[in-house]
């Protein structure tokens, strides 16, 4: 969490941002809140990106003002116009690109004063893994697949029964470049699995950590997966 305060001139206002990560090709949110004003027409929101000379987005007098928007953000940004009055200056970024990563500044002017806060935005690709029993294999084998990751993640297997065991000798992980030539499909195979055990396939890079669990018993197979972003720090 980054909390920024205004400078000189008018009074300062508190602006708060939260570091976040964007998934390439999907929509992302750059979070920013500020002390609200009672009049929408008095609020100016400017989003800027370090090293980019045009604006990322500008909202003033109750509407978007994009004449000075940088070409790299053309048609990809929006604020939540109906929430600006309550102090939400968050930016929706459509079709996140790898090059969107960097330091952003949320700069606010209201009748109460000015303020700004920076936000670190990481970009990459992350997806939920799915673990299945590979019935085509000669021995009991589990296959963990996740369709989109970038940068290349690490894959670690764990089991509930053999806690602390190192499965690197009995697993094989491959990374296959997807058609857009950036993200990769992750496939990891674990051999010699035993029934009545829960196995976890953990995929992690510097942006996200995802786990796919599978519980194999004689009568059923239970699956569960979850994904966690690693860098949500507020400012």
């Amino acid at each position: 969490l980054i909390i920024g305060f205004g400078i000189s001139g008018r009074h300062s206002i508190t602006v708060t941002t939260v570091a976040s990560a964007g998934n390439i090709g999907e929509d992302g949110i750059l979070s920013c809140t500020f002390e609200p004003d009672i009049k929408l027409s008095d609020i100016v929101i400017q989003w800027l990106k370090e090293g980019v000379l045009g604006l990322v987005h500008e909202f003033k007098e109750g509407k978007d003002e994009l004449s000075e928007q940088d070409e790299m953000f053309r048609g990809r940004t929006a604020v939540f116009a109906d929430q600006v009055i309550v102090g939400n200056a968050s930016l929706r970024l459509k079709n996140v690109q790898l090059t969107d990563a960097g330091t952003y500044k949320c700069y606010i002017i209201t009748s109460k004063g000015k303020g700004n806060a920076n936000l670190e935005y990481k970009t990459g690709a992350f997806s939920m893994p799915e673990v299945n029993v590979d019935y085509n294999a000669s021995s009991e084998t589990l296959r963990c697949e996740a369709p989109r990751w970038f940068p290349q993640p690490t894959v670690v297997w764990a089991s509930q029964v053999d806690q602390g065991a190192n499965f690197s000798e009995v697993s094989n992980t491959s990374f296959e470049l997807n058609s857009e030539n950036v993200t990769m499909k992750v496939v990891s195979v674990l051999y010699n699995v035993t029934i009545n055990n829960t196995y976890s396939c953990m995929i992690e890079n510097d942006i996200a950590k995802a786990t796919g669990d599978i519980k194999v018993t004689e009568s059923e197979i239970k699956r569960r997966s979850h994904l966690q972003l690693l860098n949500s720090k507020a400012s």
Epitope: L53, S67, E68, E71, R74
Partner: antibody, heavy 116, light 107 residues
């Protein structure tokens, strides 16, 4: 006031290279992109590319890719445009222009003549 | 690349006339269009930016309108110093292409 002053006219032989300079004054040099536009005799305006004076990052017109190089020197607030493997059709007035989404002001122009 | 089709390519008019030059973009460019005036031997000069905004110091007889793909530059009452070549330019997507120009001549 904001001013862009370009280097003088050049005469070059086909196959040679030319380097045109554009010195900026009257504003924060790193605050806006610098663009290059050329105009062949009696013809219209052709966008050549741009440079970000902060980072040095460039975007070039596809037809000039591989022949054009834009650089900058922040210590002297100067940008450079170098065009290599010159041919007769590169004979033109070359302009630098400052901006984000519109160009203002423009340099006075540099005439580059390519002739054997 | 986005194509900018400007018309007419040349135009004869008299002092005091109202003159309209049009520019059509090959795709939607919102209001990312600029208009420049160029006189012989001189660099182009910005007249209108963001489709309709008058650049500081430019006389109010110049105006711009339009959004999407169709745009217009209007000179409400031609003055002798207005005889020049006019260019539109899109700044929606690189390369920031120009129209082919409209030469405004004295009738």
């Amino acid at each position: 006031q904001v001013q862009l002053v370009q280097s003088g006219a050049e005469v070059k032989k086909p196959g040679a290279s030319v380097k045109v300079s554009c010195k900026a004054s009257g504003y924060t040099f790193t605050a806006q992109y610098m663009y290059w536009v050329r105009q062949a005799p009696g013809q219209g305006l052709e966008w050549m590319g741009r440079i970000n004076p902060t980072s040095g990052n460039t975007v070039y017109a596809q037809k000039l890719q591989g022949r054009v190089t834009m650089t900058r020197d922040t210590s002297t607030s100067t940008v450079y445009m170098e065009l290599s493997s010159l041919r007769s059709e590169d004979t033109a007035v070359y302009y630098c222009a400052r901006g984000i989404n519109w160009f203002d002001p423009w340099g006075q122009g540099t005439l580059v003549t390519v002739s054997s | 690349d986005i194509q900018m089709t400007q018309s007419p390519s040349s135009l004869s008019a008299s002092v005091g006339d109202r003159v309209t030059i049009t520019c059509q973009a090959s795709q939607d460019i919102s209001n990312y269009i600029n208009w420049y005036q160029q006189k012989p031997g001189k660099a182009p000069k910005l007249l209108i930016y963001a489709a309709s905004r008058l650049q500081s110091g430019v006389p109010s007889r110049f105006s711009g309108s339009g959004s999407g793909t169709d745009f217009t530059l209007t000179i409400s009452s031609l003055q002798p110093e207005d005889f020049a070549t006019y260019y539109c330019q899109q700044s929606y997507r690189s390369p920031f292409t120009f129209g082919q120009g409209t030469k405004l001549e004295i009738k």
